[in-house]
């Protein structure tokens, strides 16, 4: 019961994770004109890794899309890579976890798939989450580079009579949106491969028996064919307890099968 | 067709306060900031604050800060400028203006002139 | 604040000649957001309200001549009225509209000679 929670609830905190991850992506508010010195301003600018837009106190809106790709900041087309891989990622892991979910039978799928599904789901979402974050940190860190930089012109060459406004950009609500979903799809994911160790099948002691007497054969190993398509649960000749207890060092097998994901 | 429509002249004392109103049709009134501008007698032009009409949020030139209230009426679409502490400086004619593209102001009330004498 | 800067304070043109004003802010009212800038021409009658001409700084509002042309970037701008009409005797003013307190120009004269 508790392991079905765990699992449900990884994928729910992931589901949301993931939806916040696709907004953040597409919200026009990554960087914000920087109000600090006139709070109440005539035209505001923000940005995002799409378009860029102006507000005028008008109420009138006006956005314009980057059409060019080539003519774009290497940091920004690595930002937007990293939050595309993030969401197909994540995607990918949804719809494989929701195959995996122990609530949902498909056909005569044994526990030992759903275990590998959720493990392999979970980690996509462990990436997922991970090049989410990446992306917006990379995208915070350029804009408290270019801010200190234009701080820096704001107070040269201001000799003559003419002051040229140098707009500055901070933080924009995108980024929080994306810290925040990235943390939620990695909390999922790790939630997913924690109940990844409650599903493995419980094996019996026929089994055990049965693969005892097999020796140290690969080819008859229990679960041997299901190894060999992705999806086995025992790869190493360890003792199987009563009960489907298992040792720390078997756990730690699994992620050694899903070196594809 | 867009009609800005302002009350009438009013004279009053220093020391006091006026309310002039600006009654807005044929356009849809919460889309647009409304504006306020005066002309002191034979002078330019000068900008007061503006309010918008959706949120009720208003921007005051620092200048009247504390003197002038800008309010709304969505169910008449009319827009009311209060300017308190009255000073025969403020002898005037006030102006509302529906603000644009731009930040332009694309139509403008017929004027409403104050006075203040003592 | 911006301030704003027109010159001449007073202009005589014959009808049909060309008549050139300038405004001039002091900061820039350029918009690194949407490149535009942010300065608005209007003309004033007496005994009327003013009436908006250009906004964007070279802009046209629809219904106004062509014969009236915004120009300039930055800080330095320009109102052309290519041929002088009779109806075109008012004073014209430029205002900022990039920065709080919206700040207008005291106003250029334009007369027939």
């Known amino acids: 019961m508790a392991v079905t929670a765990c699992q449900g609830l990884g994928f729910v905190v992931s589901l949301i994770g993931i939806a916040g991850i696709i907004a953040a992506t597409c919200m026009d508010q990554w960087s914000t004109q920087d109000l600090y010195n006139n709070p109440v301003t005539a035209v505001f600018n923000y940005q995002g890794l799409w378009r860029s837009c102006v507000r005028e106190s008008s109420g009138f809106t006006e956005c314009r899309g980057y059409f060019t790709l080539l003519g774009l900041p290497a940091m920004l087309q690595a930002v937007r890579a990293l939050m595309i891989v993030g969401i197909v990622l994540g995607a990918i892991g949804l719809l494989v976890s929701i195959f995996a979910l122990k609530c949902i039978r498909i056909g005569s799928m044994e526990d030992s798939a759903k275990a590998n599904m959720t493990l392999t789901s979970g980690i996509m979402f462990i990436v997922s989450g991970l090049c989410a974050i990446a992306g917006v940190s990379v995208f915070a860190n350029m804009l408290v580079t270019n801010f200190w930089m234009s701080t820096a012109n704001m107070y040269t060459g201001m000799g003559g009579m003419v002051q040229t406004v140098q707009t500055r950009y901070t933080f924009g609500a995108a980024l929080f949106v994306g810290w925040v979903a990235g943390g939620l799809t990695l909390i999922g994911g790790v939630m997913m491969c924690i109940a990844c160790r409650g599903l493995a099948p419980e094996e019996t002691n026929y089994k055990a028996v049965s693969y005892h007497a097999s020796g140290h054969s690969v080819a008859y190993k229990p679960g041997g064919f299901k190894a060999s398509t992705g999806f086995g649960s025992n790869t190493k000749n360890k003792k199987i307890y009563d009960g489907g207890a298992r040792t720390e060092d078997e756990v730690q097998s699994y992620p050694s099968k899903h070196d594809y994901v | 067709q867009v009609q800005l429509v302002q009350s009438g002249a009013e004279v009053k004392k220093p020391g006091a306060s006026v309310k002039v109103s600006c009654k807005a049709s044929g356009y849809t009134f919460t889309g647009y900031n409304m504006n306020w501008v005066r002309q002191a007698p034979g002078q330019g032009l000068e900008w007061m604050g503006n309010?918008?009409?959706?949120?009720?949020?208003?921007s005051y030139n620092q200048k009247f800060k504390g003197r002038v209230t800008m309010t709304i009426d969505k169910s008449t679409s009319t827009v009311y400028m209060e300017l308190s502490s009255l000073r025969s400086e403020d002898t005037a004619v006030y102006y509302c203006?529906?603000?644009?593209?731009?930040?332009?102001?694309?139509?403008w009330g017929q004027g409403t002139t104050v006075t203040v004498s003592s | 604040d911006i301030v704003m800067t027109q010159s001449p304070d007073s202009l005589a043109v014959s009808l049909g000649e060309r008549a050139t004003m300038n405004c001039k802010s002091s900061?820039?009212?350029?918009?690194?957001?949407?490149?535009?800038?942010?300065l608005t021409w209007y003309q004033q009658k007496p005994g009327q309200p003013p009436k908006l001409l250009i906004y964007w700084a070279s802009t046209r509002k629809s219904g106004v001549p062509d014969r009236f042309t915004g120009s300039g970037s930055g800080t330095d701008f320009t109102l052309t009225i290519s041929s002088l009409q009779a109806e075109d005797v008012a004073v014209y003013y430029c205002?900022?509209?990039?920065?709080?307190?919206?700040?207008f120009g005291g106003g250029t004269k334009v007369e027939i000679k």
């Open positions: 203006a529906r603000m644009y593209h731009g930040n332009a102001f694309d139509y």
């Open positions: 900061q820039s009212l350029l918009n690194s957001g949407n490149l535009k800038n942010y």
């Open positions: 309010i918008d009409p959706y949120y009720g949020g208003t």
């Open positions: 205002q900022n509209d990039y920065s709080y307190p919206l700040t």
